[in-house]
Interface confidence: low
């Protein structure tokens, strides 16, 4: 019966939506009006009132109804007078919602639309800090970045001020993220003040002023390790060959190296003249795979290059006269040992392959058993799932969700009307071929507490807080380990390049460039992402959606964060925060049923709520037409 009611609501909503222009809430022909107190954009967590006043010819409304994202609200509605009603929300936490109201008129079979409005909640911006400007050699640009602070959830813009200290000339730029300023436009000498204003509908903040000298912020052209050779001597030594195209005369460099099995880097420092290829000697253990990276800075200056691509070299077991090897660069600009999962073999020995194979067989068997149990016993499957997840290796369920057999996906594929063609937020891209996963750190300048011999663990060393970004746009998606992260845009360092081989060429990134609340220590990953707004399916019927996912989440219970696996699939590149307590908003892809569980799973997370895109009503319009059929 409950399902029938919900579907009947949907049919009513369908009729209402048919009576609108096809352009979302801003184009509604209203028969009355709807307004929000205190405002349509308000601080997250506030109590708000939504008022609806009917002005329909020949209609004294029997009842006034409110809908949020296409779902009828049933509580906290007060009738104020014959034509007006109020809907009250306590502690409203959704970043975006589309509201509309309808009237039940006598002698009318269906509800009549009164009006609609998009509402948004969020926070005023923090004071931008850690303003950093660098010039990557040969780039022709000064790249300025800053720490935007906490998530605002609403459109936040930044005005970057660049003022010459010599001519007093000031230029201002509007951006949503970082900024590249052509050095040709910096004609007011060498010394500048740079500061950033952050502004949104809820407030405005201004950073401290950063004083820069153009000669002091140049980062030399990237240093690259080209090859390695091990020479048989009394004590075998390994020579690493490396070079840079820099024209800067005085350059200081660091090379760090470690056995791939180690967590600790050793660091060697060099004063370098790049008129010829550099050779650095190392005395290494035999028969061990080592990884090397190099980075440089103009001597005495502030900013370092990002670390170069990981360069691998395995020392020979019994040393021949000369062993020369130009080992592959598994990734670019990485601070971590690479997990390179290719369509071919993993770069590990045979024992690793056998382990992987065994794990996959065990997983397949368990999955079959689970599926059978899931079909026959709904209550049993939820209980056993958690215990199984504790037993199986984390990598088996961690980062690669598969929607191939999901009924939701099948339903969506069969009914393409569900997808809103002009909606960038709702793109269905099912089952891409995952060829590899790469984890990459994007470091910036040398920390002040940096030691010559770095003995700290890999994860906590050498990765300063501010990363410098460039023009590549990437999209955030939720991450399994941190529980949840919304979608946003972000940018990669100028000095960083995708690998020369064809590994990553299939990634054409064209998301919007308009939103960024950048976090610290980003790691670049290629991830699957199922970027369909689940909240818009959810409103159809609890049975329709949650029933399909009942193996993963029983309606009345909460499960571990891997519930997201079944909700995301699209090959995407993303930057992701290390810290679980940092989330980066712009678009949530989870329905509230899931979200309530995530809060329990990770207590450090701030309150997380479903994001409803501005054009959600249009997707409801499309989706509900399916019911009519």
């Amino acid at each position: 019966m409950n399902q029938v009611t919900i579907q009947w609501d949907a049919v009513i909503a369908l009729y209402i939506l048919f009576s609108w222009c096809h352009g979302g809430i801003t184009n509604i022909n209203c028969s009355g009006h709807i307004w929000v107190e205190p405002a349509t954009i308000f601080k997250m967590g506030m109590n708000i009132s939504i008022y609806c006043q009917a002005a329909i010819k020949n209609c004294q409304p029997r009842k006034l109804h409110f809908y949020k994202n296409g779902i009828k609200e049933r509580f906290q509605i007060t009738r104020i007078n014959k034509t007006t009603a109020r809907l009250w929300y306590k502690n409203f936490l959704e970043p975006h919602a589309s509201m509309y109201c309808t009237a039940e008129c006598p002698k009318h079979f269906q509800e009549t639309l009164i009006c609609g409005k998009d509402i948004s909640s969020g926070y005023p911006p923090d004071i931008p800090d850690e303003v950093t400007c660098v010039i990557y050699e040969y780039s022709g640009n000064m790249t300025c970045t800053w720490n935007a602070g906490k998530l605002t959830y609403i459109d936040t813009k930044y005005v970057v001020h660049v003022k010459s200290l010599e001519t007093e000339e000031e230029q201002q730029y509007l951006t949503s993220s970082y900024i590249n300023i052509s050095t040709d436009s910096l004609q007011g000498g060498k010394k500048y003040l740079v500061w950033v204003q952050a502004a949104n509908a809820l407030g405005m903040e201004e950073s401290k002023q950063l004083q820069i000298h153009l000669d002091d912020i140049v980062i030399p052209s990237a240093a690259v390790i080209s090859r390695a050779e091990t020479i048989n001597a009394t004590v075998p030594k390994t020579i690493i060959y490396w070079d840079s195209q820099t024209t800067i005369e005085k350059v200081s460099c660091e090379m760090r190296y470690k056995a791939t099995t180690n967590q600790t880097w050793n660091v060697k420092e060099f004063d370098t003249n790049f008129t010829y290829v550099q050779q650095s000697e190392f005395y290494l253990e035999p028969n061990i795979k080592y990884v090397f990276q190099v980075r440089c800075q103009e001597t005495g200056k502030r900013y370092w290059q990002p670390w170069s691509s990981l360069f691998f070299h395995k020392t020979p077991e019994t040393v021949p006269q000369v062993t020369s090897k130009a080992f592959q660069h598994d990734t670019w600009n990485s601070g971590l040992t690479v997990a390179s999962i290719s369509t071919g073999h993993l770069t590990s020995d045979n024992r690793g392959d056998i382990g992987l194979l065994l794990g996959m067989i065990v997983f397949a068997v368990m999955l079959s058993i689970l599926s059978l149990i899931g079909i026959f016993n709904r209550s049993f499957r939820t209980g056993i799932k958690r215990r199984i997840l504790l037993l199986i290796p984390k990598w088996l369920y961690e980062d690669i969700p598969n929607m191939k057999n999901s009924n939701v996906v099948k339903m969506l594929q069969e009914n393409s009307e569900l997808m809103n063609n002009n909606s960038s937020e709702q793109v269905l891209y099912v089952d891409p071929m995952i060829t590899e996963i790469k984890e990459i750190f994007i470091p910036e300048h040398k920390p002040t507490d940096y030691k010559k011999e770095n003995t700290g663990p890999l994860e906590t060393r050498d990765y300063p807080q501010n990363s410098l970004f460039d023009n590549t746009t990437v999209v955030y998606i939720p991450d399994l380990n941190t529980g949840y992260k919304p979608q946003i845009s972000n940018f990669l360092p100028e000095g960083s390049h995708l690998s020369n081989n064809n590994e990553i060429t299939s990634l054409t990134l064209k998301p919007p460039v308009d939103s960024l609340d950048s976090g610290n220590n980003p790691r670049l990953q290629k991830h699957p992402n199922f970027a369909f707004s689940v909240s818009s399916v959810n409103s159809l019927s609890n049975t329709i959606f949650l029933g399909e996912l009942s193996l993963i989440l029983n309606q009345g219970e909460c499960s571990s964060p891997d519930i997201q696996n079944s909700v995301e699939e699209e090959t995407t590149m993303l930057l992701e925060n290390d810290s679980p307590s940092e989330t980066i908003p712009e678009q949530t892809l989870l329905p509230d049923e899931f979200v309530s569980c995530l809060g329990i799973v990770n207590e450090e997370l701030p309150s997380i709520n479903t994001y409803f895109p501005q054009n959600i009503l249009e997707s409801h319009f499309n989706r509900i037409s399916l019911l009519e059929k």
Epitope: T167, E170, Y173, T175, I179, Q197, M204
Partner: antibody, heavy 128, light 107 residues
Framework: QVQLVQSGAEVKKPGSSVKVSCKAS????????ISWVRQAPGQGLEWMGG????????NYAQKFQGRVTITADESTSTAYMELSSLRSEDTAVYYC?????????????????????WGQGTLVTVSS | EIVLTQSPATLSLSPGERATLSCRAS??????LAWYQQKPGQAPRLLIY???NRATGIPARFSGSGSGTDFTLTISSLEPEDFAVYYC?????????FGQGTKVEIK
């Protein structure tokens, strides 16, 4: 099509204040700088100050500092210029002008402080 | 503040003739200079910005040149509607300043 519509003519007494409004339509109001320029009868153009509506960042010519206040209301896409302690030499046509559009360079907008859209002008007469 | 001096104050020419207007800055303004046209009873109209870029919808007969302190607006062949007052404006430094104007009148 972008339009800037200014409030009507004003006659003021010396020592009083005047507040002129400028309502923008047909474009994104908050992303462009709005400036106020005045022109005394038979004279040239004089820049008084400007504001970036999204940030509220305002800049004033030294000559008017302390006497002029420029504000913007994003919700109504309206900019305001208030001039206080009026004197007879403040009699002029006051124009609001919007920053040059098409200033998008990659991800950002450069604030040009050249003006490609102007209001129709508001004549403020200061007379005792 | 930067003072912009326009010359001549008045230019008397016939339709079809070439008009050359000059604007000199008291200190370098790089290429941050614009030209406007104003007709009686109307608001100014942007012609050229950043010394030499024509604004949208401005005919090709209008061109700008110069950098540093000396700038020129050239109207290659005067049309009847080109007779007006022309102002230069710099945005290199606060405050923004305008020249005093050059009136182009029909001879």
């Amino acid at each position: 099509q972008v339009q800037l519509v200014q409030s009507g003519a004003e006659v003021k007494k010396p020592g009083s204040s005047v507040k002129v409004s400028c309502k923008a339509s047909g474009g994104t109001f908050d992303s462009y700088a709005i400036s106020w320029v005045r022109q005394a009868p038979g004279q040239g153009l004089e820049w008084m100050g400007g504001i970036i509506p999204i940030s509220g960042y305002a800049n004033y010519a030294q000559k008017f500092q302390g006497r002029v206040t420029i504000t913007a209301d994003e919700s109504t896409s309206t900019a305001y210029m208030e001039l206080s302690s009026l004197r007879s030499e403040d009699t002029a046509v006051y124009y609001c002008a919007r920053d040059l559009s098409g200033g998008y360079l990659g991800l950002r907008t450069l604030y040009y402080y050249y003006f490609d859209y102007w209001g129709q002008g508001t004549l403020v007469t200061v007379s005792s | 503040e930067i003072v912009l001096t326009q010359s001549p104050a008045t230019l008397s020419l016939s339709p079809g003739e070439r008009a050359t207007l000059s604007c000199r800055a008291s200190q370098s303004v790089s290429s941050y200079l614009a030209w406007y046209q104003q007709k009686p009873g109307q608001a100014p109209r942007l012609l050229i910005y950043d010394a030499s870029n024509r604004a949208t919808g401005i005919p090709a007969r209008f061109s700008g040149s110069g950098s540093g302190t000396d700038f020129t607006l050239t109207i290659s062949s005067l049309e009847p509607e080109d007779f007006a007052v022309y102002y230069c404006q710099q945005r290199s430094n606060w405050p923004l300043t305008f020249g005093q104007g050059t009136k182009v009148e029909i001879k």
